[in-house]
């Protein structure tokens, strides 16, 4: 019961996390204009991974996509890549984990197979979460660097009498959404991995030799595929499959898969 709850909760947490990663990736407010030096601006600038926007005094917002690949900073491309990899891995992880859920029965799928799928999806969620956190952190670092560079530029040159104040950018809402979403996906993945341990059969199942001692006579019965000493209660010599060997029916096919301003 606890295993099912842990697995289900892990799935739900990961689902929320991946939805958040997708939302963050699509959001325009990765960086927003810093209003510290100009709190009365009638023109508010903000930028996302895919386009930059300007909200004017009329309330009208104009967004322009980055219609070039080669003209974009390498860091921005890297962040895009990390977020997309995170989304793809998370989506595959969700697909795998749906089939792995203990509460869902699909044919005669063994718990061991579900355990493997749970572990696979858990690892995918962990990597997905790490990708999102890394992507957001790289972007945040880029912002911090640019912020202090533009601050330095503001007070140098032309004797400090610069007419055009360079627009500085600070953290946008998407960064916080991304961090939280990445963290949730990571936590969900860890929960799935924990659930996997509980899903795997508790007792060691032996499928090798079973010895029946009656006085001095020993009955030898071959069973399974590997020779090992059997001390279990498998007195009727039923073959127990633990995932090491599967019939053809048991083999599962796992889902696998502008101008920069």
């Amino acid at each position: 019961m606890a295993v099912t709850a842990c697995q289900g909760l892990g799935f739900v947490v990961s689902l929320i996390g991946i939805a958040g990663i997708i939302a963050a990736t699509c959001m325009d407010q990765w960086s927003t204009q810093d209003l510290y030096n100009n709190p009365v601006t009638a023109v508010f600038n903000y930028q996302g991974l895919w386009r930059s926007c300007v909200r004017e005094s009329s309330g009208f917002t104009e967004c322009r996509g980055y219609f070039t690949l080669l003209g974009l900073p390498a860091m921005l491309q890297a962040v895009r890549a990390l977020m997309i990899v995170g989304i793809v891995l998370g989506a595959i992880g969700l697909l795998v984990s749906i089939f792995a859920l203990k509460c869902i029965r699909i044919g005669s799928m063994e718990d061991s197979a579900k355990a493997n799928m749970t572990l696979t999806s858990g690892i995918m969620f962990i990597v997905s979460g790490l990708c999102a956190i890394a992507g957001v952190s790289v972007f945040a670092n880029m912002l911090v660097t640019n912020f202090w560079m533009s601050t330095a530029n503001m007070y140098t040159g032309m004797g400090g009498m610069v007419q055009t104040v360079q627009t500085r950018y600070t953290f946008g809402a998407a960064l916080f959404v991304g961090w939280v979403a990445g963290g949730l996906t990571l936590i969900g993945g860890v929960m799935m991995c924990i659930a996997c341990r509980g899903l795997a059969p508790e007792e060691t199942n032996y499928k090798a030799v079973s010895y029946h001692a009656s006085g001095h006579s020993v009955a030898y019965k071959p069973g399974g595929f590997k020779a090992s000493t059997g001390f279990g209660s498998n007195t009727k010599n039923k073959k127990i499959y633990d995932g090491g060997a599967r019939t053809e029916d048991e083999v599962q096919s796992y889902p696998s898969k502008h101008d920069y301003v």
């Epitope: 204009q33 100009n38 009365v40 601006t41 009638a42 023109v43 600038n45 930059s52 300007v54 004017e56 005094s57 009329s58 309330g59 009208f60 104009e62 322009r64 007419q163 055009t164 104040v165 360079q166 627009t167 301003v261």
Partner: antibody
Framework: QVQLVQSGAEVKKPGASVKVSCKAS????????IHWVKQAPGQGLEWMGY????????NYNLKFKDRVTMTSDTSISTAYMELSRLRSDDTAVYFC????????WGQGTLVTVSS | DIVMTQSPDSLAVSLGERATINCKSS????????????LIWYQQKPGQPPKLLIY???TRDSGVPDRFSGSGSGTDFTLTISSLQAEDVAVYYC?????????FGGGTKLEIK
């Protein structure tokens, strides 16, 4: 087409308040800010502030901040500008304006403050 | 506050001639976010509300004749009427659309010589 229709002329005594309305049509009322501009007789234009019907936010010119209140009623697509503690120098035509670059203006409301 | 200074205060130009009105702001109206200048030009005739001519310093509003053009960047801007028509007699205002409070120039009265 986009239209801003303002309420009629008002005559007020000093110290009183006046509330001018601006009814919008032809566009999504909550998408654009409604700005208010004052023009005293024979004078130039003076921005008073704006109301954002979408979120109720507003921004006032400090010159009017303590006396002006801008509100909106999205159900009837109408913006209001209330000016309190009227003085003789508040005698002016008050315009509401909206759209990109203030593309659309109301016809103006003459407010006369006289004892 | 950004102070908008228009020159001249009044201007008399012959029909068909070029009219030029200048506007200077005390601070730059250039937005580095989209590389645009946030200056607006209006035309106002007696008893009427102002009419938008140019926004973002050089973008003509729809329906505005192409004899009207705006130019300039940073702090210095110009409205040009390439060939003055009788209906162009009006007061012209420039406006800072970059920083609150939004401020207007004092106006330039354009007349026919």
């Amino acid at each position: 087409q986009v239209q801003l229709v303002q309420s009629g002329a008002e005559v007020k005594k000093p110290g009183a308040s006046v509330k001018v309305s601006c009814k919008a049509s032809g566009f999504t009322f909550t998408s654009y800010n409604i700005h208010w501009v004052k023009q005293a007789p024979g004078q130039g234009l003076e921005w008073m502030g704006y109301i954002s019907p979408g979120n109720g936010g507003s921004n006032y010119n400090l010159k009017f901040k303590d006396r002006v209140t801008m509100t909106s009623d999205t159900s009837i697509s109408t913006a209001y500008m209330e000016l309190s503690r009227l003085r003789s120098d508040d005698t002016a035509v008050y315009f509401c304006a909206t759209g990109r670059g203030f593309a659309y203006w109301g016809q103006g409301t003459l407010v006369t403050v006289s004892s | 506050d950004i102070v908008m200074t228009q020159s001249p205060d009044s201007l008399a130009v012959s029909l068909g001639e070029r009219a030029t009105i200048n506007c200077k702001s005390s601070q730059s109206l250039f937005n580095s976010g989209n590389q645009k200048n946030y200056l607006i030009w209006y035309q106002q005739k007696p008893g009427q509300p102002p009419k938008l001519l140019i926004y973002r310093a050089s973008t003509r509003d729809s329906g505005v004749p192409d004899r009207f053009s705006g130019s300039g960047s940073g702090t210095d801007f110009t409205l040009t009427i390439s060939s003055l028509q009788a209906e162009d007699v009006a007061v012209y205002y420039c406006q800072n659309d970059y920083s609150y409070p939004l401020t207007f120039g004092g106006g330039t009265k354009l007349e026919i010589k």
